[in-house]
Interface confidence: low
């Protein structure tokens, strides 16, 4: 830690005297802060010397010396008083700026420590301090107003009693700024606007700030609009409101409107888009595919997005068939408004039954007319398999019918012994039917295919299984002929239900 000579901590001299302050450290040392021109500064090895041949009251202040190389960052200080009977105060700054609730140091330094007992703080021209002004005094630093308030932003003077008269310092202006937490708060109403050409419209841009020093403007595309500003103060905030009123809109009024407000902390901006249209419009769309496939027993939500101006005058969901004349229950239909001109309509179809496959239409109406959006709902089914023994053109044949959706694939398995299902170890042969015959393929219904296995391939006392599968699941049916071609209808005990 550096050492200052003389040792201090205070040194009192008279005006005109010579003053020498020497700072000595282990390494190089330096004096802190701005050194006034009245001082001569020179270095002498590990010491730094400040000297003046003609001390004045303006040299009154604390001089601090530091050793930059010191890892502990220590410093030494000495306070110099130049006691001038005519000048009891040395004011270091004529203006002090703080934020509310900070301590404000008014740097009027006493030039003579003896005068400390008779000091006081007053407002300009001797006016008393405002009530509740909490302050303290330090001869080294000046007066501190604690937790300064906005209203305490005034001109102050430091007063010292010299004999029987009070001697005032030059005035110090205290500016107390409100704490600005960020850019002004903004609202731009509405968030989006649509009007038909010739209609009236209004856009309101409002900003609020903790103090009055902020700017707000409304901009159309790249043009700042000249709009009268209405100012107000409520809820402890300053409000500025710009209202753009358009009696009859035209296409040139369309575009992007930005409400922009700025203060010392920065700027805040919010935008909205104004569309001007020739006539009423009504657009229906869906993010979903209009052709839907769902597994039977599962649920589905059908969603339609509506963009409309003016607003809807009516809407509903309708089941168009083909199976029953049921209509969707109103409780299963839900409407949500995303914003003024966009709505989402949802139809919930829980635990779908085969009779609920088909077409569902959403209809909406506004002054622009009617629009409809139709979904086609097909149910997916796992395959159902049946096998029969029949004679075709005099030959014994196994027929397998598989019904499901999507269309099932068919595979025949031959396995040893009698079983209701061929497992991997028992399989002797596998036949894949690449092109089963399509028996029926009606809209919104299962697809039924048929596969044939002829008698010459059949062997006595073996199990034949027809297996079908699709994306939903699989099904199978096993059959055991007693002797190839011996019977048209084998006994019931040889039919195995999967």
């Amino acid at each position: 830690i550096p050492v200052i000579e003389p040792s201090g901590p205070e040194l009192v001299v008279k005006p005109g005297e010579m003053v020498t302050l020497r700072c000595v450290g282990n390494g190089s040392v330096e004096w802190d802060g701005p050194i006034s021109p009245h001082w001569t500064l020179y270095s002498d090895g590990p010491s730094s010397v400040l000297t003046t041949t003609n001390a004045t009251f303006q040299n009154t202040r604390t001089y601090r010396c530091t050793e930059p190389g010191d890892p502990l960052g220590g410093s030494a200080a000495i306070h110099l008083y130049v006691k001038d009977p005519a000048r009891p105060w040395n004011v270091l700054a004529k203006e002090v700026v703080v934020f509310e609730d900070q301590d404000a140091l008014l740097p009027c330094l006493l030039t003579d420590p003896v005068l400390e007992a008779g000091v006081s703080l007053v407002r300009l021209r001797g006016r008393p301090l405002l009530r509740h002004t909490n302050y303290s005094f330090s001869p080294w630093h000046g007066f501190t107003i604690h937790r300064a308030k906005f209203i305490q932003g005034q001109d102050y003077q430091c007063s010292a009693l010299m004999g029987s008269r009070k001697v005032m310092s030059i005035s110090i202006r205290l500016k107390v700024q409100k704490v600005i937490p960020g850019p002004p708060a903004l609202t731009l109403v509405p968030e989006e606007l649509v009007r038909i050409r010739g209609e009236a419209a209004q856009i309101v841009c409002s900003a609020s700030n903790i103090d009055v020093d902020f700017d707000v403007f409304l901009q159309h595309n790249t043009t700042k609009l000249a709009i009268p500003q209405r100012s107000d103060f409520h809820d402890n905030r300053y409000q500025k409101v710009l209202t753009l009123s358009l009696g009859q809109v035209d296409f040139q009024h369309a575009g992007n409107y930005s409400c922009v407000a700025s203060n010392v902390q920065g700027k805040h901006s919010t935008s909205m888009f104004f569309r001007v249209v020739e006539s009423a419009y009504l657009d229906l769309s869906s993010e979903q595919n209009l052709i839907q496939e769902v597994t039977v027993g599962e649920g589905l939500n059908l969603k339609v997005m509506v963009e409309a101006y003016p607003g809807l005058q009516g809407f509903n969901w309708t089941y168009l068939g083909p199976f029953s004349d049921h209509q969707p229950e109103p409780k299963l239909a839900n409407a949500t408004t995303k914003d003024t001109y966009r709505h989402t309509f949802t139809l919930s179809l829980p635990r779908l039954k085969p009779s609920e496959a088909g077409c569902y239409s959403f209809l909406a109406r506004n002054p622009g007319g009617w629009r409809a959006l139709t979904f086609e709902l097909t149910l997916r089914y796992p395959p159902e398999v049946s096998v029969i023994w029949t004679s075709i053109n005099g030959s014994g044949t196994l027929l397998c019918a598989a019904s499901g959706y999507p269309q099932p694939n068919v595979t025949w398995l031959q396995c040893a012994g009698h079983t209701d299902r061929c497992d991997e170890a028992q399989v002797l042969q596998v036949w894949v039917d690449p092109h089963p015959e399509v028996l029926s393929q009606e809209p919104f219904q299962k697809v039924t295919v048929q596969s044939l296995l002829t008698a010459e391939t059949l062997e006595h006392n073996q199990t034949y299984e027809c297996r079908a599968h699709n994306s939903v699941g699989s099904g199978s049916w096993a059959f055991i002929p007693i002797s190839a071609g011996a019977r048209t209808h084998p006994p019931d005990e040889f039919l195995f239900t999967p």
């Epitope: 600005i180 790249t222 700025s262 700027k267």
Partner: antibody, heavy 121, light 107 residues
Framework: EVQLVESGGGLVQPGGSLRLSCAAS?????????WAWIRQAPGKGLEWVSS????????YYADSVKGRFTISRDNSKNTLYLQLNSLRAEDTAVYYC?????????????WGQGTLVTVSS | DIQLTQSPSSLSASVGDRVTITCRAS??????LAWYQQKPGKAPKLLIY???SLESGVPSRFSGSGSGTDFTLTISSLQPEDFATYYC?????????FGQGTKVEIK
């Protein structure tokens, strides 16, 4: 006239630390404007590094320096600081301190002359 | 982060020429854009703020325009002291970013 003078730059090894200072004269750093450090790698463009709000209560950092650099100020000395820790070769640049302009908010109307930081082993 | 792309990256012009530099933002930044001039070895100097407002003391031959994503700096009649590098900077939102710069050289 506002004057900003940076100091504290120099040669430092990777992983090392530096403290940059920016002494303001002709204007109090507590007077509401925000302050920032902006850097420029040799032969490259400008990169915003950090800002401190007018009240000193809010600080912002570029992702590239978050957790390594700290912006601060000493109102009594009217000085802005940038503490640089865990320095990397890519931190080599001239570091400018700048004052945020009032009307332009995030634009910078006064700049210092810059101080060069070289990170090299 | 918002990217600013300046074009061209460099240009050659003669004294008296009209020069236009563009700056495109990767997303809308309203009018929160500034333009700076920087000469070798010197700190940047603010020319335009809020996309089109001329900074005090800057010659009127400099002008800015644009909003949203596309901005332009125009020097109506290039002077010898205008040969420098020009940068755009956006300040809405954080983090603030600069364009890569446009160098204006003597033809």
């Amino acid at each position: 006239e506002v004057q900003l003078v940076e100091s504290g730059g120099g040669l430092v090894q990777p992983g090392g630390s530096l403290r940059l200072s920016c002494a303001a004269s002709g204007y109090s750093i507590t007077s509401g404007h925000h302050w920032a450090w902006i850097r420029q790698a040799p032969g490259k463009g400008l990169e915003w590094v950090s800002s401190i709000s007018g009240s000193g209560s809010t600080t912002y950092y570029a992702d590239s320096v978050k957790g390594r650099f700290t912006i601060s100020r000493d109102n009594s000395k009217n000085t802005l600081y940038l503490q640089l820790n865990s320095l990397r070769a890519e931190d080599t640049a001239v570091y400018y301190c700048a004052r945020g302009s009032y009307y332009g908010a995030g634009s910078f109307d006064y700049w210092g002359q810059g101080t060069l930081v070289t990170v090299s082993s | 982060d918002i990217q600013l792309t300046q074009s061209p990256s460099s240009l050659s012009a003669s004294v008296g020429d009209r020069v236009t530099i563009t700056c495109r933002a990767s997303q809308g930044i309203t009018s929160a854009l500034a333009w700076y001039q920087q000469k070798p070895g010197k700190a940047p100097k603010l020319l335009i703020y809020d996309a089109s407002s001329l900074e005090s003391g800057v010659p009127s031959r400099f002008s800015g325009s644009g909003s949203g994503t596309d901005f332009t700096l125009t020097i109506s009649s290039l002077q010898p002291e205008d040969f420098a590098t020009y940068y755009c900077q956006q300040y809405y939102p954080w983090p603030w970013t600069f364009g890569q710069g446009t160098k204006v050289e003597i033809k």
